[in-house]
């Protein structure tokens, strides 16, 4: 259960994180499982442990094997296993499947390719990016922080992308490469200014005091994958989380794709045990994307229970 596969290339840096987490103050001991031999913590060693991280600087094929990490919490010793495989460098350009990280998909509007595992390393920008072993050049390609952005993505942009960066450890530099496939979704999407389907502008919603009430904010943003789109509720111009009323919570609904292909989002505002003071609040349904923000305001009014005697 607490086991993780890690892989790397010989003569490159490889850093592996213990599959068990813990507070920074917890001691973590590492062992080579086959021999139960403790991994040293001294940085002068080529392979050494540094808290939750196991560092191969650089890695060798003979380092392959299962490593055990034990996180010593105040109560239990929690055990994890890192299954490490170090491969020989390929002479040709093809990256074998066993060296590939998870495939990512993109579209014309959303084409970020993250460099896998980079957050484990001490690296400085810029990253180098390659596609099918060729260095990426041209204004369409932008290396930004830990990801690559491709402008105006086309079907031909699909392929294997490799990021290359330098890990620095105590003044020594080590190369790291990581490869993942990128696929292009064939969709002619578009985004438009948000359209709020519900609630209607300045809607008055009838509620019963003491009962629960739900308000749904529903908006559509265009067709296909949306780069940035969100719906949320505000109370008197304040985010729900900051408003500090535990009875009133928002709960994300399902992304909805209607038959006409529109990309829509719902956000349900749940009010438990409606109180008189809730009627005084202004409830704003906000929908926003790259085009801008649209707001519909709702107010609550008391629903009078039906008087059967009148």
């Amino acid at each position: 259960k607490f086991s993780k596969q890690s892989w790397g290339l010989e003569n490159e840096a490889l850093i592996v994180r213990c599959p068990r987490q813990g507070k920074p103050s917890y001691t973590v001991d590492w062992y080579y499982s086959q021999t139960n031999k403790s991994i040293p913590t001294q940085e002068r060693n080529r392979v050494f442990a540094s808290g939750q991280l196991l560092k191969f600087l650089p890695a060798a094929v003979a380092d392959s094997g299962i490593y055990t990490c034990i996180v010593r919490s105040p109560t239990f010793n929690r055990t994890g296993y890192a299954n490490v495989t170090i491969y020989k460098k390929q002479s040709d350009c093809n990256v074998p499947d066993y060296l590939m990280y998870s495939t990512v998909s993109g579209s014309e509007k959303n084409s970020k390719i993250y460099c896998p595992t980079i957050d484990l390393y001490n690296w400085t920008a810029p990253l180098e990016w390659f596609k099918n072993c060729q260095a990426l050049q041209g204004s369409r390609y932008r290396a930004h922080k830990s990801f690559l952005v491709i402008d105006n993505v086309m079907t031909e942009d699909a392929g294997d992308y490799t990021c290359k960066f330098i890990h620095n450890e105590n003044g020594a530099n080590y190369s790291v490469t990581a490869t993942r496939s990128f696929t292009v979704k064939d969709e002619q999407g578009f985004s438009l200014f948000p359209v709020i389907g519900a609630p209607a502008q300045n809607e008055i919603k009838e509620v019963e005091i003491g009962k629960n009430a739900n308000l749904t904010c529903s908006a559509c943003f265009g067709k296909g994958t949306q780069f940035l789109a969100a719906v949320l509720w505000q109370l008197n111009g304040t985010k729900i989380t900051d408003f500090g009323e535990p009875r009133i919570q928002q709960e994300e609904g399902q992304n909805q794709s209607f038959s006409n292909g529109l990309a829509c989002l719902d956000m349900v505002l749940r009010i438990a045990d409606v109180k008189e003071e809730d009627l005084l609040l202004q409830y704003d349904c906000l929908a926003l994307n790259l085009h801008g923000l649209r707001r519909h305001t709702v107010r609550l009014s008391r629903k009078n229970p039906i008087d059967h005697h009148s």
């Epitope: 987490q21 813990g22 507070k23 103050s25 105040p74 109560t75 239990f76």
Partner: antibody, heavy 121, light 106 residues
Framework: QVQLVQSGAEVKKPGASVKVSCKAS????????LHWVRQAPGQGLEWMGT????????VYNQKFKARVTMTRDTSTSTVYMELSSLRSEDTAVYYC??????????????WGQGTLVTVSS | EIVLTQSPATLSLSPGERATLSCSVS?????MHWYQQKPGQAPRLLIY???KLASGIPARFSGSGSGTDFTLTISSLEPEDFAVYYC?????????FGGGTKVEIK
């Protein structure tokens, strides 16, 4: 959602034993350690120990080590706390509790409703 | 074992006032957790890891401190905040709680 449901109130005589159960639901039972905390009437909270449902391993507060036994039944996602050689000062509400994220020990985010154990002759 | 001492034992305040609860530790700890308990109810986690707000807890609650001195602050007391508050350490076994601070209406 995460739920910890405990067994009902118990009345025991001094010297007897009591076994309180805590049935977990809404998450993978073996992924989270479960703890027992007790509270005597009008008093504060006292940690008794914890069990790892995956392995059955336990860690007890030294104060209770000779008298407490924590066990689990993975088939019913239930943990048990048995306290023996009861005395009147063991009269308390016994709670089972769970952290929000196991590995970070980030406080008891989930609690059972409590089980009142009364020890009286 | 690590001993947690809460002060004051009782705090008498009015709604709207600021409440400052202290927890002093017998030996240094890395983190502190805080709970609220009302009569007949199980405790509720308010603050974890010294200063992080637990899920669903209003922003008027905040935590601070380090080493041997920790503080829970309620910026403006609401009627529902009158309860008993406990600090708890998870630095070493046995896990221990403070004796509690009762916040009562003045």
């Amino acid at each position: 959602q995460v739920q910890l449901v405990q067994s009902g109130a118990e009345v025991k005589k001094p010297g007897a034993s009591v076994k309180v159960s805590c049935k977990a639901s809404g998450y993978t039972f073996t992924d989270y350690e479960l703890h027992w905390v007790r509270q005597a009437p009008g008093q504060g909270l006292e940690w008794m120990g914890t069990i790892d449902p995956e392995t059955g391993d336990t860690v007890y507060n030294q104060k209770f080590k000779a008298r407490v036994t924590m066990t689990r039944d993975t088939s019913t996602s239930t943990v048990y706390m048995e306290l023996s050689s009861l005395r009147s000062e063991d009269t308390a509400v016994y709670y089972c509790a769970r952290a929000f994220y196991n590995d970070y020990d980030d406080g008891f985010a989930y609690w059972g409703q409590g089980t009142l154990v009364t020890v009286s002759s | 074992e690590i001993v947690l001492t809460q002060s004051p034992a009782t705090l008498s305040l009015s709604p709207g006032e600021r409440a400052t609860l202290s927890c002093s530790v017998s030996s240094s700890v890395s983190y502190m957790h805080w709970y609220q308990q009302k009569p007949g109810q199980a405790p509720r986690l308010l603050i974890y890891d010294t200063s992080k707000l637990a899920s669903g807890i209003p922003a008027r609650f905040s935590g601070s401190g380090s080493g041997t001195d920790f503080t829970l602050t309620i910026s403006s007391l609401e009627p529902e905040d009158f309860a008993v508050y406990y600090c708890q350490q998870w630095n070493s076994s046995p896990l221990t709680f403070g004796g509690g601070t009762k916040v009562e209406i003045k």
